[in-house]
């Protein structure tokens, strides 16, 4: 595929990545799928500056990111190492709370109203952020 050198229309460029901010809500898996269909992934936060950039754009609204522990340990959707990477959980989080009455615990991470992270039920219809890296080979065939 060809290298992407600029962001698609309606995406925002920042530090060699492109971001798309939803204005509607979806369950985490549907948001994840939406980003994949756009040749992107749910946002992976690798620094405090990236955290603040995303916060600036989403405002104080619960918003999914590309972090989950549905298969045990916490994992970023692009393979970024969770243990050694940037983390910004709210105090006392993640807590895998079972008291919500929806069945199971809490396996998907989202930005909260103050920007810090919380784990929540993956079926909740939150907004989401897609990210794709510039200079990454896109899946589209080159124009002949």
């Amino acid at each position: 595929g060809s290298e992407r050198t600029c962001c698609p229309v309606n995406w925002v460029e920042h530090e060699r990545s492109c971001y798309w901010f939803s204005r509607s809500g979806k369950a985490w898996a549907d948001a994840d799928n939406y980003c994949r269909l756009e040749d992107a992934h749910l946002v992976v936060v690798t620094s405090w500056e990236e955290q603040k950039f995303v916060q600036h754009h989403i405002g104080p609204v619960n918003t999914w990111m590309g972090l989950h522990d549905q298969n045990g340990p916490w994992k970023w959707v692009d393979g970024t190492d969770y243990e050694t990477g940037f983390k910004n959980w709210r105090p006392e989080q993640p807590d895998d709370w079972y008291g919500h009455g929806l069945g199971g615990g809490e396996d998907c991470a989202h930005f909260t109203d103050d920007g810090r992270w919380n784990d929540d039920v993956c079926q909740r219809p939150y907004r989401w952020v897609c990210e794709t890296e510039l200079d990454k080979a896109s899946q589209e065939p080159p124009l002949l």
Epitope: W48, E49, K52, F53, H56, K87, P91, D114
Partner: antibody, heavy 119, light 107 residues
Framework: QVQLVESGGGVVQPGRSLRLSCAAS????????MHWVRQAPGQGLEWMAI????????YYADSVKGRFTISRDNSKNTLYLQINSLRAEDTAVYYC????????????WGQGTLVTVSS | DIQMTQSPSSLSAYVGDRVTITCRAS??????LNWYQQKPGKAPKVLIY???SLQSGVPSRFSGSGSGTDFTLTISSLQPEDFATYYC?????????FGPGTKVDIK
């Protein structure tokens, strides 16, 4: 009400070390990041360091990296600043301040403690 | 590091005057711009955070505006208690640098 009280300042010789403390009350200390900011006599404000609510992340001004250490004891509601190899240019009023978690601004400040480095 | 500049460095004004202080960042800091007021011998206090949000208890004559790299603090009608030094600060990227300050005194 939120209260921050710094202590530990005084006159100290160049090359010595000092540990400043900041006692916090009136809020859940363990839920907030904390800053140190200093102000040399007659000069402006200089941001020094921040520590996250649980101590997991610490960031410093380039000018003091390796010489200053920020730490906290949440069981004592106390913030610390360890200053090593003191220099004349470290003479300043040192303020602790609470971090607003959304914006990182300093929303509450202590009254400051004066450190004078002199032989 | 992000550099913050302020202008003017000092100004003299009458009670009742409209006063404007500008702050410029060396790169985009989005909405992470805060304004502080400091009186002699006292600790600073936050007036405005996130460009235009007024801190609780701060009079409405203070307002903030701007975006990206250029920001403004406005005092709509200067009061005797407003004579002080004003600092802007970016809290986007560490180190969280302050501007050099603007001293507002009585004409």
């Amino acid at each position: 009400q939120v209260q921050l009280v710094e202590s530990g300042g005084g006159v100290v010789q160049p090359g010595r070390s000092l540990r400043l403390s900041c006692a916090a009350s009136g809020f859940t200390f363990s839920s907030y990041g904390m800053h140190w900011v200093r102000q040399a006599p007659g000069q402006g404000l200089e941001w020094m360091a921040i520590i996250w609510y649980d101590g997991s992340n610490k960031y410093y001004a380039d000018s003091v990296k390796g010489r200053f250490t920020i730490s906290r004891d949440n069981s004592k509601n106390t913030l610390y600043l360890q200053i090593n190899s003191l220099r004349a240019e470290d003479t300043a009023v040192y303020y602790c301040a609470r971090e607003d978690p959304r914006t990182s601004c300093s929303d509450y400040w202590g009254q400051g403690t004066l450190v004078t480095v002199s032989s | 590091d992000i550099q913050m500049t302020q202008s003017p460095s000092s100004l003299s004004a009458y009670v009742g005057d409209r006063v404007t202080i500008t702050c410029r960042a060396s790169q985009n800091i989005f909405s992470y711009l805060n304004w502080y007021q400091q009186k002699p011998g006292k600790a600073p206090k936050v007036l405005i955070y996130a460009v235009f949000s007024l801190q609780s208890g701060v009079p409405s004559r203070f307002s903030g505006s701007g975006s990206g790299t250029d920001f403004t603090l406005t005092i709509s009608s200067l009061q005797p208690e407003d004579f002080a030094t004003y600092y802007c600060q970016q809290s986007y990227s560490t180190p969280f640098t302050f501007g050099p300050g603007t001293k507002v005194d009585i004409k």
